[in-house]
């Protein structure tokens, strides 16, 4: 039973670490300018990004990521592997 408890705790801890590393990954993408910056201009390198600015880019990268995930789900449902399962469910309605 103690092993099970440890397993559950480890799983929860791993999920937290995964979320943190995903956040770090997004931040590293932002730091490298992947996906384009929001406030792009000729004098971009004149001064470091303000926190609010970097938060804005982080949010933009995250929203792009969420959008891509939503599109992937849509494609799977209407053109891909989830379509057949949905057809079966439609038949049950």
């Amino acid at each position: 039973r103690r092993d099970v408890a440890h397993g559950i705790l480890n799983e929860a801890y791993r999920k937290v670490l995964d979320q943190l590393s995903a956040g770090k990954h997004l931040q590293s993408l932002v730091a490298r300018g992947v996906g384009g910056s929001l406030g792009g201009g000729a004098g971009d390198d004149a001064e470091p990004l303000s926190k609010r600015h970097s938060d804005g880019i982080f949010t933009d990268s995250y929203s792009r990521y969420r959008k891509q995930m939503a599109v992937k789900k849509y494609l799977a449902a209407v053109l891909g592997k989830r379509y057949k399962q949905r057809v079966k469910n439609k038949g049950r309605r």
Epitope: Q68, A70, V71, K72, Y74, L75, A76, A77, V78, L79, G80, K81, Y83, R86, V87, N89, R93
Partner: antibody, heavy 108, light 109 residues
Framework: SVEESGGRLVTPGTPLTLTCTVS????????MSWVRQAPGKGLEWIGF?????SAYYATWAKGRFTISKTSTTVDLKITSPTTEDTATYFC??????WGPGTLVTVSS | AAVLTQTPSPVSAAVGGTVSISCQSS???????LAWFQQKPGQPPKFLIY???KLASGVPSRFKGSGSGTQFTLTISDVQCDDAGTYYC??????????FGGGTEVVVK
């Protein structure tokens, strides 16, 4: 079933909303897509609305269209129509059940 | 943006014969999420094949989809008069959604 309505002759720049009415379809379980077809031309995907009501658009369609829904209808608003928007507009559940389409003509 | 290029129209087929239509994508189709549709004049498109090779419900096994990555083919064997129409491929792209090919008209003689 799926059926589109609202198509008509409009002048350029006059916003127009098309409505897709569904029956026997739970819109909280299915994606709804909009596709258009200019006279004598091919199919063009506009975008879709998610089960939770979030809308996503083709790159070319962003800002030109708005998709929204209620429990039994899905709307497509053409924000500022141009003559290039003259087409038959189709609504589809997923992409396997399509309505007959509604014709929009944009002309001055 | 991704571009899907189909076999130029029209393509002729004899009743009982075989016809193939190609669909080439300018970039790789996400997870081979490619579909084929049939459309007849004055009607909405009909869903035939999904995920490149899987038959949609109620579609005769005479229709066969194949291919992967950027190159896909729809083959209709034992062609019937009712198969006349325009066929469209549609590819899924994770960054931009769905793109349709330009369509290929099949004429049955």
């Amino acid at each position: 079933s799926v059926e589109e309505s609202g198509g008509r002759l409009v002048t350029p720049g006059t916003p127009l909303t098309l409505t897709c009415t569904v029956s026997g379809i739970d819109l909280s379980s299915y994606y709804m897509s909009w596709v258009r077809q200019a006279p004598g031309k091919g199919l063009e995907w506009i975008g879709f609305i998610d089960t939770d009501g979030s809308a996503y658009y083709a790159t070319w369609a962003k800002g030109r269209f708005t998709i929204s829904k209620t429990s039994t209808t899905v709307d497509l608003k053409i924000t500022s129509p141009t003559t290039e928007d003259t087409a038959t507009y189709f609504c589809a559940r997923d992409l396997d059940l399509w309505g007959p389409g509604t014709l929009v003509t944009v002309s001055s | 943006a991704a571009v899907l290029t189909q076999t130029p129209s029209p393509v002729s087929a004899a009743v009982g014969g075989t016809v193939s239509i190609s669909c080439q994508s300018s970039e790789s189709v996400y997870s081979n999420y490619l579909a084929w549709f049939q459309q007849k004049p004055g009607q909405p498109p009909k869903f035939l094949i999904y995920e490149a090779s899987k038959l949609a419900s109620g579609v005769p096994s005479r229709f066969k989809g194949s291919g992967s990555g950027t190159q896909f083919t729809l083959t209709i064997s034992d062609v019937q008069c009712d198969d006349a129409g325009t066929y469209y491929c549609a590819g899924g792209y994770s960054s931009e959604g769905v793109a349709f090919g330009g369509g290929t008209e099949v004429v049955v003689k």
